[in-house]
Interface confidence: medium
């Protein structure tokens, strides 16, 4: 046979769908891996194919698309289930070919169980709402394709297991979901439940996201340093463990970088020769503020060592911080009882 | 999860000393100041004094200054009260109580808290 | 130091009652943004529990009956419909600064 351009199995689209439940699944190649869409390709003379092998299977073996009611069928470049069962999990392979050109991709399709709560093993999406922004909304997603306009679906929400009526900040509003004004007891997950007619058929579209409630940005701060400050002095004597924590705590912001580092003289700690250790940990808040510790540590101190500036720095998309560490040697105690000794003749 | 584990409880003689302990586990004890609270039979609670582990800094109240002696050892995140010359006035449960870390720079509040060590002093 | 004075000392309630109890300091312990009051429940041969942080922020895992207000000098902890569970002493506690804490007296709530 000759050659194909093979992109191997497409893990990064690892497609999940609900037994008995429509699904249209389009090809992965003109998506991300050609430059030219299947109108393009079509015109040029190209023909798509579609393959799969099943679940624990070897074998490539070609779809069936003549089973009763057309319960597989490829329109375009979409393959579609009307509905799916649970044996179609399976790796599945797109091929668009003719005499003189090749390319494949293969992608997984999983066909996952729901209980009458709609929980199952589909990794959800997650959408994030500012705690108490005012009215913000979510959209029953991926649900576009499956029916024309002039279909008029019937949409049902839940909380959990619960229908969404009366609720006190929540309200329905066909594809959309309404919070009029989000809480952390809105914390949870949401579905929509698309019902639609289709040649004499009803076809059900299950949606499930979790919807996490953050941070405002309307109460985001610079990065506040709570540790160097300057209630804390560390003393120690040369040979002694030096430990100083930099605990910096971040406003949630959507899609910001923070960074917490140490200098030690203004330069990085791996700049430098002195053996510096530094480790980190990051906790979050119930609104995913974050506080992230990096605790720098040098094992046996010198005097040199005590000399130094150790400054704590932060950044996140709302400014730059940095505290200096108060760090200093302790002087010996005088000793008494020696000196008080000879003072009074003892020998 | 956070837990404070106090020692048991003390019964020492007017005049001795005794050393309380509290054992920090689920977050890194050295970032956290630890608090020790007083609290006598039927009374309210009485702020003793505080120690950040990763320094040995300590701030008391100057009604315990000369009383109590913080210190920790990082090694085994244990937080560790030191009582001198003891009279029937310092029979009381002692708690041990860490600071939480809030978005605001001080005034921290005290999110955990150990079972309490009772000391009774008496001849 | 700041003093703090609580009232009333004891306080009785039914169950489904609205409680209220209030905390007086002798200054501000608020700067912008944010106060230094926090409210404690204690309840006999037990440690206190942290209800209330920085004024009106209840902790996790405290139910929604609980509430606080306040800024300056004058707080309230409220419990809107007191449950079985609820009798108890009550503390409020500033953490105004460095190196000073101080609690209030305590106020017990107990079954009428």
């Known amino acids: 046979s000759e050659r194909c351009d093979d992109w191997g199995l497409d893990t990064m689209r690892q497609i999940q769908v609900f037994e008995d439940e429509p699904a249209r699944i389009k090809c992965p190649l003109f998506e991300h891996f050609l430059k030219f869409n299947y109108s393009t390709a079509h015109s040029a003379g190209l023909t798509l194919i579609w393959y799969w092998t099943r679940q624990d299977r070897d074998l490539e073996e070609p779809i069936n698309f003549r089973l009763p009611e057309n319960r597989i069928s490829k329109e375009k470049d979409v393959l579609w289930f009307r509905p799916t069962l649970l044996n179609d999990t399976g790796n599945y392979t797109c091929m668009l070919r003719n005499t003189t050109y090749c390319s494949k991709v293969a992608f997984p399709l999983e066909v996952v169980q729901k209980d009458s709560c709609f929980n199952s093993p589909m990794k959800l999406p997650v959408h994030k709402l500012y705690i108490e922004y005012g009215i913000q909304r979510i959209t029953c997603p991926n649900v576009d394709g499956y029916f024309p306009s002039s279909v008029k679906p019937t949409i049902t929400w839940y909380m959990g297991c619960y229908k969404i009526q009366n609720f006190n900040n929540v309200i329905p509003e066909g594809m959309n979901l309404s919070f009029l004004i989000a809480l952390i007891s809105n914390n949870g997950n949401y579905t929509c439940v698309v019902t639609y007619p289709e040649n004499g058929r009803t076809f059900h579209l299950t949606r499930t996201l979790t919807v996490k409630v953050v941070g405002s940005p309307k109460n985001a701060v610079p990065p506040v340093i709570h540790s160097p400050n300057d209630h804390v002095v560390y003393e120690k004597e040369p040979g002694e463990e030096l430990l100083i924590p930099c605990t910096v705590y971040f406003s949630f912001l959507m899609d910001s970088r923070n960074e917490v580092w140490w200098t030690i003289d203004g330069k990085k700690p791996d700049d430098i020769t002195i053996d510096v250790t530094i480790n980190e940990s990051i906790s979050h808040s119930r609104t995913e503020d974050e506080t992230r510790t990096q605790i720098l540590s040098i094992k046996k101190v010198t005097s040199e060592d005590l000399k130094r500036s150790y400054v704590c720095h932060a950044r996140s998309a709302k400014g730059e911080v940095a505290k200096a560490a108060k760090v200093k040697q302790k002087v010996p105690a005088p000793r008494y009882t020696v000196e008080l000794a000879c003072g009074f003749g003892a020998t | 999860h956070v837990q404070l584990q106090q020692s048991g409880p003390e019964l020492v003689r007017p005049g001795a000393s005794v050393k309380l302990s509290c054992k920090a586990s689920?977050?890194?004890?050295?970032?956290?100041?630890m608090n020790w609270v007083k609290q006598r039979p039927g009374q309210g609670l009485e702020w003793v004094g505080q120690i950040f582990p990763a320094s040995g800094t300590t701030y008391y109240n100057e009604l315990f200054e000369g009383k109590a002696t913080l210190t920790v050892d990082t090694s085994s995140n244990t937080a560790y009260m030191h009582l001198t010359s003891l009279t029937s006035e310092d029979s009381a449960v002692y708690y041990c109580?860490?600071?939480?870390?809030?978005?605001?720079?001080?005034?921290?509040?005290?999110?955990?808290w150990g079972q309490g060590t009772s000391l009774t002093v008496s001849s | 130091d700041i003093q703090l004075t609580q009232s009333p000392s004891s306080l009785s309630a039914s169950v489904g009652d609205r409680a209220t109890i209030t905390c007086r300091a002798s200054q501000s312990v608020s700067t912008s943004g944010y106060s230094s009051m926090h409210w404690y429940q204690q309840k006999p041969g037990k440690a206190p529990k942290l209800l209330i942080k920085y004024a009106s922020d209840l902790e996790s895992g405290v139910p929604s009956r609980f509430s606080g207000s306040g800024s300056g000098t004058d707080f309230t902890l409220t419990i809107s419909s007191v449950q079985p569970e609820d009798f108890a002493t009550y503390y409020c506690h500033h953490s105004w600064g460095i190196p000073m804490y101080t609690f209030g007296q305590g106020t017990k709530l107990e079954i009428k």
């Open positions: 109580a860490r600071t939480d870390f809030y978005r605001y720079d001080g005034g921290y509040a005290l999110d955990y």
């Open positions: 689920g977050y890194i004890f050295i970032t956290y100041w």
